[in-house]
Interface confidence: low
């Protein structure tokens, strides 16, 4: 039975040219995280494998950085980066958990950053 829940940064906004952290946290389960995939719509951005470490998709390697933790940092943001991002936690024995984050990249210099992600 899957008892875990994914907490995410939710809906966030950032300024064009800036950077933002996408972060998810899996709680309420003792399942082992074997791999985390970060995807944008249907494109794979990065993988963090428990044994092999990080792999960044070649098409994103100049603008995506691993971390903090299992999170992902997007740099040099463009308006085209606006959209849905998914963290997909592959766990054993529970299976797969998915979290969703919506990022809006704003032209304005008064972009409001979403609430900082805090683990209680």
């Amino acid at each position: 039975m899957m008892t875990g829940t994914i907490e995410t940064t939710g809906n966030i906004s950032a300024e064009k040219g800036g950077s933002i952290i996408l972060q998810c946290h899996l709680s309420s389960t003792t399942a082992q995280v074997t791999q985390v995939n970060w995807e944008q719509q249907d494109q794979l951005l990065a993988i963090c494998n428990a044994d092999l470490g990080w792999h960044i998709s070649p098409s994103f390697k100049d603008r995506v950085a691993p971390g903090p933790g299992l999170g992902l940092t997007l740099q040099s943001l463009t308006v085209n980066d606006t959209g849905e991002y998914f963290c997909i936690y592959h766990t054993y024995p529970d299976g797969t958990y998915t979290g969703r984050i919506f990022l809006e990249v704003l032209e304005s210099s008064v972009a409001e950053h979403g609430a900082r992600f805090q683990i209680p």
């Epitope: 082992q32 995280v33 963090c48 903090p68 900082r116 683990i119």
Partner: antibody, heavy 119, light 110 residues
Framework: EVQLLESGGGLVQPGGSLRLSCATS????????MSWVRQAPGKGLEWVSG???????YYADSVKGRFTISRDNSKNTLYLQMNSLRAEDTAVYYC?????????????WGQGTTVTVSS | QSGLTQPPSASGTPGQRVTISCSGD????????VSWYQQLPGTAPKLLIY???QRPSGVPDRFSGSKSATSASLAISGLQSEDEADYHC???????????FGGGTKLTVL
């Protein structure tokens, strides 16, 4: 050559405040995660706080609500504002530069500045 | 704040191989890279191993790191007197959203 130089340490009474600075050179300061790490006399390393390139901040439970990390990219300087200081905050405070990949650790350390909290 | 567990001390004679362990749990060592730091007496820490097993330039290949599940190890072969120092392991903890260090291991060269 990458250099980190801490300053601002000293003797302060319990409940007092101090502001530590870390002047950096030799690398693109704004592109790296930076941390403060402390070491109490005769003890191991304790990570205090870190600031990401996106300006997201992270703190050890022991200093949350009392310490504030910040950075001034125009001055290539990292800061740690320490309020409500306690005797257990007595330590050498090191400024540390993160590796390009945050999870790879801290690849350059300053020489440290000593903070003593005592009445 | 929970951290990583290291033995407080280790020792060896010149030329010997010594190993220092660092154990954690699923939220830190299991899913993240471990780094190792050497701290010579009276000096600041220095990065010795990053990414579990990679050496920065200038670090002798006598130093090697490895990781298996939630435990990491630092091995020093051909022990030399100048290796006498404190050794600290560290990693990012996904639950705490914080860096954590081990308590440090004091290595004595007999």
């Amino acid at each position: 050559e990458v250099q980190l130089l801490e300053s601002g340490g000293g003797l302060v009474q319990p409940g007092g405040s101090l502001r530590l600075s870390c002047a950096t050179s030799g690398f693109t300061f704004s592109s790296y995660w930076m941390s403060w790490v402390r070491q109490a006399p005769g003890k191991g390393l304790e990570w205090v706080s870190g600031i990401h390139i996106s300006d997201s901040t992270y703190y050890a439970d022991s200093v949350k609500g009392r310490f504030t990390i910040s950075r001034d990219n125009s001055k290539n300087t990292l800061y740690l504002q320490m309020n409500s200081l306690r005797a257990e905050d007595t330590a050498v405070y090191y400024c540390a530069k993160g590796h390009t990949v945050l999870q790879y650790g801290m690849d350059v350390w300053g020489q440290g500045t000593t903070v003593t909290v005592s009445s | 704040q929970s951290g990583l567990t290291q033995p407080p001390s280790a020792s060896g004679t010149p030329g010997q191989r010594v190993t220092i362990s660092c154990s954690g749990d699923i939220s830190n060592t299991r899913n993240n890279y471990v780094s190792w730091y050497q701290q010579l007496p009276g000096t600041a820490p220095k990065l010795l191993i990053y990414g579990n097993h990679q050496r920065p330039s200038g670090v002798p290949d006598r130093f090697s790191g490895s990781k298996s599940a939630t435990s990491a190890s630092l091995a020093i072969s051909g022990l030399q007197s100048e290796d006498e120092a404190d050794y600290h392991c560290g990693t990012w903890d996904n639950t705490l959203n914080a860096w954590v260090f081990g308590g440090g291991t004091k290595l004595t060269v007999l």
